[in-house]
Amino acid sequence: MAPWPELENAHPNPNKFIEGASGPQSSIPDKDKGTSKTNDSGTPVAKIELLPSYSALVLIEEPPEGNDPWDLPELQDNGIKWSERDSKGKILCIFQGIGKFILLLGFLYLFVCSLDVLSSAFQLVGGKMAGQFFSNNSIMSNPVAGLVIGVLVTVMVQSSSTSSSIIVSMVASSLLSVRAAIPIIMGANIGTSITNTIVALMQAGDRNEFRRAFAGATVHDFFNWLSVLVLLPLEAATHYLEKLTNLVLETFSFQNGEDAPDILKVITDPFTKLIIQLDKKVIQQIAMGDSEAQNKSLIKIWCKTISNVIEENVTVPSPDNCTSPSYCWTDGIQTWTIQNVTEKENIAKCQHIFVNFSLPDLAVGIILLTVSLLILCGCLIMIVKLLGSVLRGQVATVIKKTLNTDFPFPFAWLTGYLAILVGAGMTFIVQSSSVFTSAMTPLIGIGVISIERAYPLTLGSNIGTTTTAILAALASPGNTLRSSLQIALCHFFFNISGILLWYPIPFTRLPIRLAKGLGNISAKYRWFAVFYLIFFFLLTPLTVFGLSLAGWPVLVGVGVPIILLILLVLCLRMLQARCPRILPLKLRDWNFLPLWMHSLKPWDNIISLATSCFQRRCCCCCRVCCRVCCMVCGCKCCRCSKCCKNLEEEEKEQDVPVKASGGFDNTAMSKECQDEGKGQVEVLGMKALSNTTVF
């Protein structure tokens, strides 16, 4: 038995309730099938309305052996062929195509803008706390603590460039050594991969789409975690990154250059600056130990200021702190000196929404977080819808072949490296690995890009973001040039080392296998995706940080037994899979452990019970929202469930034994409507959701 056994159906015989479900279910999503419903023998099946409580059961069925859920779906064209259209139809089709393309660009623009606002929101909510993490210099000398600080700060501010610039400032002002900064940079690398994982969560509507999207996003996470797992101990033992970057800096003479062109920011800034503008220096000041910065707001109020340099008498501890002996005196009580003080004169206020609101940072952060996540979710659904309707037939075939086909033999191995370069180039253009990987996530979900191709593109994105950092470092002022360049190079060589570890030999492409495994689990237990996100990006780093505060002995005392236990489980798992004969009978599977220790099923039941309580309270809201959405998208045939009735009454009416009433079983989300009778489109892109998920 595997550690995470497949989920059985909620009822032993689902066919009792679902007509036409006698044969094995096809793994091709409904939207990719024809419009006529047939059973496996080919005979038409009467179209039935599924009971709300069981509308998701078909999706829970295990995919049959012959059908690999990781195979990219066929994006069939169910529309009228071009040749069959009349001239009016052709013109209409062209305009429709142009309209869809404009809409796609519009939603993509909104998507990128909402990512930017999301980052600002995170900074407002957790930016000051993130700065405080950095201000604790004593623990940062501990590489493990440094690593988790890097993760936490980047997760909190949703921007590796912000955390990197804080590190650069700290190194430049000798608050932090390059040696201590390297683990933090590694942590920042991990933290930045959370964004596309959050984006993947938005595709939880369709199991197979979610499976692919989540795996495609977490391949980035696994690459970063595995790289750190190997390279952090290596760096702690040998300091190879520090030495290598020192060598590079000494070998080549670097002059101040120009910063990387900020193509994307030029387009998105006019819009995002109308929503919110932040003073990112505040987080930096907190990190540098400026106590006054704690009381400053991150929200930028004045956008145009004039700096006046005035001479001011300031008190100093002793004449040694004076600007020069000529400008040092005492009034008999304190020692004074003359200093040039820059006074800021406010000229013009910023033009964003929150400029005149006297709301605290946290409140603005929560508002923006909610709004940006909703916009992000909406945009993603619309992008997936539009792509789904555009990428059909010949277009889909061409795009999929272009993206996923390897070069002819013997150059097939070069394809991946070209993908790495493409990923690096694209990231360099958009100036953000988060934007690139987040934009790629829905494409992986709908099956345009395979996980195998997404992996090198993601690795390239990791390289692209470091080349951007190198250029940014070259554009930095003289006093921070060396430190910022060394940190950018450390980041670069860390990613190069990671690629060398986990890419060249196909056998070592462990992140793909792990991501697929996580994708399978998350597709079945969708709440596990949220758990993964919270556990790996928040709870684990916070726990390690807490233990680090307690000191090395505590960290080692708690950490070593946990690591040994994980290694033991991994070894046992390997032996169970490879050579179970050498193991005693009891250890050949996990049945010797209680079910909750080796299966997600009991946990799933608990979460299902919890969400059923939640469902009772908010199902009516869902129904109202569903109707509003139906009106907005103009789909006349969508059905919103009558879930406002007490669920217990419904159960009595149906006289069906229910194991655990699950998440949002809203049939509105499963009923499909005809798009001019040609292709099927789901309402808001959401299919029937699992009976046992949190979503």
Partner: antibody, heavy 121, light 107 residues
Framework: EVQLVESGGGWVQPGGSLRLSCAAS????????MYWVRQAPGKGLEYVSG????????YYVDSVKGRFTISRDNSKNLLYVHMGSLKPEDMAMYYC??????????????WGQGTLVTVSS | DIQMTQSPSSLSASIGDRVTITCRAS??????LNWYQQKPGKAPKVLIY???SLQSGVPSRFIGSGSGTDFTLTISSLQPEDFATYYC?????????FGQGTRLEIK
């Protein structure tokens, strides 16, 4: 006309305490730093203590730190020094002096006539 | 603490003479040095502040100069009322310190 008049001097046994006062007139008392400077018989001048115009900051020379307390009452134009745990070496003529405004190099531009403190058993 | 050393400790001069008193600081004090005159039984009176500025009401025969560690007070033409003890004082750093004084007597 600027005037500074000290009072409160006298004879005291070692270990005893005394409070000297300085009454100021003829200028805006609350705008100036005020000082106490002493001169032992037949010796040179020695700076003792100073207080800022608002009375929030003060300074004491090491030899009197912890024993003397300087204070001022701007509403009454009075400067005080409370001298505790007096030692024979504290015996001197105590002068009250006016300084410039805050943050200005210390110049004792006006002095009182002084009050004598005698410490002996 | 900054030590201030005056020389000579005492000097005799006649009316009309040009007299120079020097003051040396143990470390550079810029120009933050003041000169005082004290007559027996009286309170001191400021003559020169910040090394060379003449206090209002003080005759112009008193000239201050110097910077860093070496300073001089020059009385260009000695008058009967000038016979007194002269002190230098630094206002560079706390504690404020005075020189030991120079006694100027009639020859």
């Amino acid at each position: 006309e600027v005037q500074l008049v000290e009072s409160g001097g006298g004879w005291v046994q070692p270990g005893g305490s005394l409070r000297l006062s300085c009454a100021a007139s003829g200028f805006t008392f609350s705008s100036h730093i005020m000082y106490w400077v002493r001169q032992a018989p037949g010796k040179g001048l020695e700076y003792v203590s100073g207080i800022s115009s608002n009375g929030l900051s003060s300074y004491y020379v090491d030899s009197v730190k912890g024993r003397f307390t300087i204070s001022r009452d701007n509403s009454k134009n009075l400067l005080y020094v409370h001298m505790g745990s007096l030692k024979p070496e504290d015996m001197a003529m105590y002068y009250c002096a006016r300084g410039g405004r805050d943050r200005v190099p210390a110049v004792f531009d006006y002095w009182g006539q002084g009050t004598l403190v005698t410490v002996s058993s | 603490d900054i030590q201030m050393t005056q020389s000579p400790s005492s000097l005799s001069a006649s009316i009309g003479d040009r007299v120079t008193i020097t003051c040396r600081a143990s470390q550079s004090i810029g120009t933050f040095l003041n000169w005082y005159q004290q007559k027996p039984g009286k309170a001191p009176k400021v003559l020169i502040y910040v090394a060379s500025s003449l206090q209002s009401g003080v005759p112009s025969r008193f000239i201050g100069s110097g910077s860093g560690t070496d300073f001089t007070l020059t009385i260009s033409s000695l008058q009967p009322e000038d016979f007194a003890t002269y002190y230098c004082q630094q206002s560079y750093s706390v504690p404020i310190t005075f020189g030991q004084g120079t006694r100027l007597e009639i020859k």
